[in-house]
Interface confidence: low
């Protein structure tokens, strides 16, 4: 029976993910009952990704490790639309690490997932990045410019944003 075997497959996939995420929120994509996309509860979803705002204050390295334990990375922002979605879930008086760093301090910015760094799709605050000793990027709110990126020292604890691909079951 087709529906029965599909359900069994789904359940075994769910069990597989349960070790990382005890609870998943799934929605049916399109009209086909076969296509379910899931994000861990209480992550938020946008397009093909899931996002988690981590409110614990940690260094950039520890923040990335924290995301990876959950099967994610620090967030890689690819479009203005994606950033506009993310900022809806942020607090204006906080700063959040992005998955963007300049390990050598030579302004060779790189994303954690190896996505090519594209100058044309960056949202630095004006005058940023400005310090070669500040090798990690955050997103924060400035009253004059709304939300944008700033370079800071990687060891200074901040909140962070994790991103992972949606889970399809």
């Amino acid at each position: 029976n087709f529906m029965y075997s599909k359900t069994v497959k789904r359940l075994s996939k769910l069990r597989e993910y349960q070790q990382y995420h005890p609870s998943l929120t799934c929605v049916m994509e399109g009209k086909d009952i076969e296509d379910w996309s899931c994000c861990p509860t209480p992550w938020t979803s946008f397009q093909s990704s899931c996002y988690f705002i981590s409110t614990g204050m940690q260094s950039w390295t520890k923040s990335q490790k924290n995301c990876s334990v959950m099967g994610a990375d620090l967030v890689v922002i690819n479009t203005r639309e994606e950033q506009d979605f993310i900022i809806q879930n942020l607090k204006r008086n906080s700063s959040y690490f992005l998955g963007l760093s300049d390990p050598g301090g030579r302004r060779h910015w790189q994303w954690v997932d190896q996505t090519p760094y594209n100058e044309n799709v960056t949202f630095w605050h004006s005058g940023e990045p400005n310090n070669l000793d500040e090798r990690c990027a955050i997103i924060n709110f400035r009253s004059s410019e709304e939300w944008g990126w700033n370079d800071i020292h990687c060891h200074v604890p901040q909140k962070s944003i994790c991103k992972m691909k949606k889970i399809y079951i």
Epitope: G105, R106, G127, N130, N131, L132, D133, E134
Partner: nanobody
């Protein structure tokens, strides 16, 4: 604040070389990241190069990369700018600047400035 005095400027033909020096006094030199900036007539002062406190991290403006070399001698409280393959567009007054702790390209982050030394490159 640290006091800074530049020297080594002059007139040179295109393709030639000059070495600028900057002597620092008054404060612990190793507390300061150092930078070179320049200002051509009628233009704004612009970033040229900067170097970290230890000297391990130089950084350059794209326009001088591969031609200019910044270095420092912490034992002598000196910072240098070796300028090779000079071009007429390098003509400017060159300023040495000091900034507590942070290696940066931004003028407004530097709290101590020298008086400047004139570099003229003729074609």
């Amino acid at each position: 604040q640290v006091q800074l005095q530049e020297s080594g400027g002059g007139l040179v033909q295109a393709g030639g070389s000059l070495r600028l020096s900057c002597a620092a006094s008054g404060r612990t030199f190793t507390n300061y990241a150092m930078g070179w900036f320049r200002q051509a007539p009628g233009k704004e002062r612009e970033f040229v190069a900067t170097i970290s406190r230890s000297g391990s991290m130089p950084y350059y403006a794209d326009s001088v990369k591969g031609r200019f070399t910044i270095s420092r001698d912490n034992a002598k409280n000196m910072v240098y700018l070796q300028m090779n393959s000079l071009k007429p567009e390098d003509t400017a007054v060159y300023y040495c600047a000091a900034n507590v702790l942070v290696t940066t390209t931004r003028l407004d982050q530097y709290d101590s400035w020298g008086q400047g030394t004139q570099v003229t490159v003729s074609s």
